[in-house]
């Protein structure tokens, strides 16, 4: 806390400008009006304030807005956002995607901080669902964002938003998350034709049940091994050797290289040796 001291004569700030960088902390506290700061927040980022000076500016805003900053201030926080705690951010009501983008830009290139996580949580909860524009924005800044959500949070993603999801956005998703996303993707892409459908659904197949895999095996999709390795173990186990051969097409030879890994290992164990021998890969059940 900065002690309350009177502003020296002639030092009262008329606007937020570069002259303020020469002010001591106590002078900033005494001479900068919080309301002026709030209306000229967009200027703060252009001025090379020290971290200590930014602390003072934050303190002034906190005093002016004890219940949380208005969005007009939040949108222009810039680097001052890095000074905010998750507790501060929980008081905010951020509704504009532009505000969200502005703040994410400040943290760009860094891992998702607790502050950013709280901001995103507040924003998404305020919107009620993870719409396509929001998802587009979040995955652009954080490709792993979708997979950082719990299955419960993912349930608020409408199928229409699935179009915004890129394969790399699903790289770190676990089976429980894909279990939620797959039915949404199936719904989103249902009107596409066979080959186009497979291209789009491929990244989500880690949540596909056995019956859908059996159906795909009848469509000459030639699934690659990387996708096959991501399938749910319980979905793969009931597949016959013939179905796996059809599903993988020319990629079936890749099973040999993965025979010690799940789910291939578990699937091999459950097959009759005679059936495995038809593949000519030397797989031992």
């Amino acid at each position: 806390e900065v002690e309350k001291t009177a502003c020296p004569s002639g030092k009262k700030a008329r606007e937020i400008d570069e002259s303020l960088i020469f002010y001591k902390k106590w002078e900033l506290e005494a001479c900068v009006d919080a309301a002026l700061l709030a209306t000229q927040m967009d200027r703060v980022n252009a001025i090379p304030f020290t971290y200590e000076q930014l602390d003072v500016l934050k303190h002034k805003l906190d005093e002016l807005y004890p219940q949380g900053y208005p969005e007009s201030v939040i949108q222009h926080l810039g680097y001052l956002f890095l000074k905010m705690s998750p507790e501060d951010i929980r008081k905010w009501n951020v509704t504009s995607l532009e505000t969200l983008k502005a703040l994410l830009e400040v943290n760009k290139g860094h891992e998702m901080s607790p502050q950013v996580a709280t901001l995103i949580d507040r924003f998404v909860k305020g919107r009620g669902q993870l719409d396509k524009d929001t998802l587009d924005t979040l995955t652009a800044f954080y490709p792993g964002y979708l997979c950082s959500l719990s299955p419960e949070e993912l349930s608020s993603v409408p199928p229409s938003s699935i179009w915004a999801v890129r394969p790399q956005d699903l790289d770190t998703c676990d089976p429980r998350q894909l279990d939620v996303l797959y039915p949404k993707a199936r719904l989103a892409f249902q009107n596409m034709n066979g080959s186009e459908y497979f291209v789009k659904i491929q990244s989500f197949l880690g949540g596909a049940p056995t019956e859908d895999l059996k159906a795909l095996s009848q469509q000459n999709v030639s699934m690659d091994l990387a996708t096959f390795m991501k399938l749910r173990t319980d979905a793969v186990l009931p597949l016959t050797v013939a179905e796996v051969q059809k599903l993988l097409g020319p990629h079936v030879e890749g099973l040999k290289a993965e025979e010690r890994h799940r789910p291939v290992r578990d699937w091999i164990l459950r097959q009759r040796q005679d059936d495995l021998d038809t593949l000519g890969l030397g797989l031992q059940g």
Epitope: D174, L269, G285
Partner: antibody, heavy 119, light 107 residues
């Protein structure tokens, strides 16, 4: 529910073969969804997986023990067994049998049996 | 073999604390990582399977996350009965391996 019980001698002489049996009750060793494993834990140390067997007889062993280990299954007795040859004092441990349910992990364990290798 | 490196090897914590244990695989284990709790003189108990799925009957204060090479076990609010040793284990590769264990002690 499924329960596992290890049995076998608690003392084995160096260079001899350690033999243990795990009896499965409340379930079947012939389940298609289960692998049956042996795991050991030397006193004051961590867990070491020894190997597993499937009801069909397919086995897989820890590479560091492979040359000395044999795991077998007797579906008629609902048991699976461990044989570890040429034992030394370093094989002194609590030996556990465990069920490896394919969709989870080692979800059921025996209570463990202490085997000491000493002359 | 896939080596599983657990950290820390031991930690002291108080009842009510949030505790995080990490496990790093020497190569990708996808999401085939399980977590166990072991108390002295007892067999280990499965807590989390497939990186993040809670085993039936395990309190919801236990949670797991991660995929590829980095995995985490979190106890959101440590209870007296949680003081024990915790192990991670990968089952992606046919040669199963355990982490070295993390002993959680009372501060």
């Amino acid at each position: 529910q499924v329960q596992l019980q290890e049995s076998g001698p608690g003392l084995v002489k160096p260079s001899e073969t350690l033999s243990l049996t795990c009896t499965v009750s409340g379930g079947s060793v012939s389940s298609r969804d289960d692998l049956w494993s042996w795991i050991r834990q030397p006193p004051g140390k961590g867990l070491e997986w020894i190997g597993y067997i499937y009801y069909s007889g397919s086995t897989n062993y820890n590479p560091s023990l492979k040359s000395r280990v044999t795991i077998s299954v007797d579906t008629s007795k609902n048991q699976f067994s461990l044989k570890l040859s040429s034992v030394t004092a370093a094989d002194t441990a609590v030996y556990y049998c465990a069920r490896d349910f394919v969709l989870s992990g080692f979800d059921i364990w025996g209570q463990g049996t202490m085997v000491t290798v000493s002359s | 073999d896939i080596q599983m490196t657990q950290s820390p090897s031991s930690l002291s914590a108080s009842v009510g604390d949030r505790v995080t244990i990490t496990c790093r695989a020497s190569q990708s284990s996808r999401y085939y990582v399980n977590w166990y709790q072991q108390k002295p003189g007892k067999a280990p108990k499965l807590l989390i399977y497939a990186a993040s799925s809670l085993q039936s009957g395990v309190p919801s204060r236990f949670s797991g996350s991660g995929s590829g090479t980095d995995f985490t076990l979190t106890i959101s609010s440590l209870q007296p009965e949680d003081f024990a040793t915790y192990y991670c284990q990968q089952s992606y590769d046919a040669s199963y391996t355990f982490g070295g264990g993390t002993k959680v002690e009372i501060k």
